[in-house]
Amino acid sequence: RRDVAHGILNEAYRKVLDQLSAGKHLQSLVARGVGGSLGGGAGDDAEPLSKRHSDGIFTDSYSRYRKQMAVKKYLAAVLGKRYKQRVKNKGRR
């Protein structure tokens, strides 16, 4: 069940970040995180596509990794609230 939940969350994580045109920072964060980007030095926002961790998101910057986890945690909270709300609404019918 936990694996399924993680799968749903990761999918939602990518979709939501794609849709957040206002959240330019988040979008670039995930663009770099998932797809990597060309060239670039350490002070630069660009970074090489290389390292993989357990949920399939790429990043070479530890702070960026922490930001990704924070976004994912926020989405988990939002999705969790929505799910609880849906269950509540079903119960009312």
């Epitope: 993680h6 350490a42 002070g43 961790h53 910057s61 530890y62 990794y65």
Partner: antibody, heavy 117, light 112 residues
Amino acid sequence: EVQLVQSGAEVKKPGSSVKVSCKASGGTFSDLYMHWVRQAPGQGLEWMGLIYPIFADTRYAQKFQGRVTITADESTSTAYMELSSLRSEDTAVYYCAIDQDGSFAYWGQGTLVTVSS
Amino acid sequence: DIVMTQSPDSLAVSLGERATINCKSSQSLLDSDGKTYLNWLQQKPGQPPKRLIYWASTRESGVPDRFSGSGSGTDFTLTISSLQAEDVAVYYCWQGTWFDLTFGGGTKVEIK
């Protein structure tokens, strides 16, 4: 104040595995970045990897990829580091450490792992 | 990986004198979030390391103000302005900007 208490010293045979535990108290365990660092006798420090327990998300140093597994049990606020295919060069003190502000603010007391035939 | 080069390997300083340790990284440690994740640790024999400085120059609470960190980009310095007997230890710099996180080789500080 976060406190980290590690399991006791281990003596292992080459080719075997070791699993070291690190129990955290005084913080929200699932929301901590738990790292593992080792130090061979008289040598410097070497980062092995990390786990973010809330998602069981791990990141390993390339050097240890495929040989190290970091896990966490949220119910007991305990992280584990398992190192397989042990060799004599793995004889070291293994530390768990917790990130705060992007650096290791809290350290366990260390666990000595001796690999000897 | 980022290579962290510390110098000198060891340092003997008289009590009350200044001790300076240098640390050089093979790549800039300035992150895109504007922070520089360069840290200094102190390790005494038989003890785990202890955080002294993070973000290149921010002193850990409880650390005496004789310890200071400076530098940016690739060049960093830890200064002990007036060495005390209890400062005898090995000091490590390490970077937390880029994976894999990497450490300097350490500098042993002794009393002359």
